[in-house]
Interface confidence: medium
Amino acid sequence: SPVPPSTALKELIEELVNITQNQKAPLCNGSMVWSINLTAGVYCAALESLINVSGCSAIEKTQRMLNGFCPHKVSAGQFSSLRVRDTKIEVAQFVKDLLVHLKKLFREGQFN
């Protein structure tokens, strides 16, 4: 039987849910971020992408949470090998994709 996520990961999922469900105006004024490969090292890659968005209070909590999951220091402008080359998407879509991925992770082993 699957075990629920750690408190920290549960809170990250909750925050992503809040962002996607409470979104009224374009998230972060429609800012674009690098799309990432969601197959491995997802937390650091997500942070490397989102850290380039500044002045967007709606995702600051998400950025802090991802920082807690990434073992190494991440700074703006850092290149990730997990980045999908030359593909940028809106922050809103990035957050939704990340949430869908995390949900899939926790449904694995739960559903046959």
């Epitope: 699957p2 075990v3 629920p4 996520p5 849910v17 949900k103 926790f106 449904r107 739960q110 559903f111």
Partner: antibody, heavy 119, light 107 residues
Framework: QVQLVQSGADVKKPGASVKVSCKAS????????IHWVRQAPGQGLEWMGA????????AYNQKFKGRVTMTTDTSTSTAYMELRSLRSDDTAVYYC????????????WGQGTLVTVSS | EIVLTQSPATLSLSPGERATLSCRAS??????LHWYQQKPGQAPRLLIY???QSISGIPARFSGSGSGTDFTLTISSLEPEDFAVYYC?????????FGGGTKVEIK
């Protein structure tokens, strides 16, 4: 607003099968799991199983394994629960509910479908 | 399978009184415990999730506490519409399970 609307009451004979439907609206159907819970007359709540509409993957309570099948039709945002080889003790109200992920609460429920098994 | 034991089975109280309902899990389920209210002929309604988190639209007189194996639902001052059956639910692991319920009836 979120709604889960179930099919009407049904009467079946022992040994027969029943298929209950649950039409979802007011949210993105594939974003939430659909779980089925039943309640025999004057009794408590019993979890039967769940389906992930996005993949069609299912998880069943061992008690019902082999007798229950849960499916979805994403084109109509409808979930189905079929129970076979009905017995008199399957007489109950059957509810569909939605859950974001299995550890989340059941935040919306269908109105319930009474299935009566009688000869 | 996680077994949830609710007590008491029946609670007889008057409007305005405080109701304290207990739910005990057979093993540690952290805070993955949810509470529902059910009235005759109606579907259950979510009251509290993750043991103590409140739901918008649910009156503030309903509160939850506990973690691990022991959980409590408190209704600070019973209103006439609060007389119903209350169930706790394990959200920690499959199979999802419910407690047997506590019926809060008018004394």
């Amino acid at each position: 607003q979120v709604q889960l609307v179930q099919s009407g009451a049904d009467v079946k004979k022992p040994g027969a099968s029943v298929k209950v439907s649950c039409k979802a609206s007011g949210y993105t159907f594939i974003d939430y799991e659909i779980h089925w819970v039943r309640q025999a007359p004057g009794q408590g709540l019993e979890w039967m199983g769940a389906i992930d509409p996005e993949t069609g993957g299912t998880a069943y309570n061992q008690k019902f394994k082999g007798r229950v099948t849960m499916t979805t039709d994403t084109s109509t945002s409808t979930a189905y629960m079929e129970l076979r080889s009905l017995r008199s003790d399957d007489t109950a109200v059957y509810y569909c509910t939605r859950i974001l992920l299995y550890y989340y609460p059941m935040d919306y429920w269908g109105q319930g479908t009474l299935v009566t098994v009688s000869s | 399978e996680i077994v949830l034991t609710q007590s008491p089975a029946t609670l007889s109280l008057s409007p305005g009184e405080r109701a304290t309902l207990s739910c005990r899990a057979s093993q540690n389920i952290s805070d993955y415990l949810h509470w529902y209210q059910q009235k005759p002929g109606q579907a259950p309604r979510l009251l509290i999730y993750y043991a103590s988190q409140s739901i918008s639209g649910i009156p503030a007189r309903f509160s939850g506490s506990g973690s691990g194996t022991d959980f409590t639902l408190t209704i600070s001052s019973l209103e006439p519409e609060d007389f119903a059956v209350y169930y706790c639910q394990n959200g920690h692991s499959f199979p999802l399970t419910f407690g047997g319920g506590t019926k809060v009836e008018i004394k």
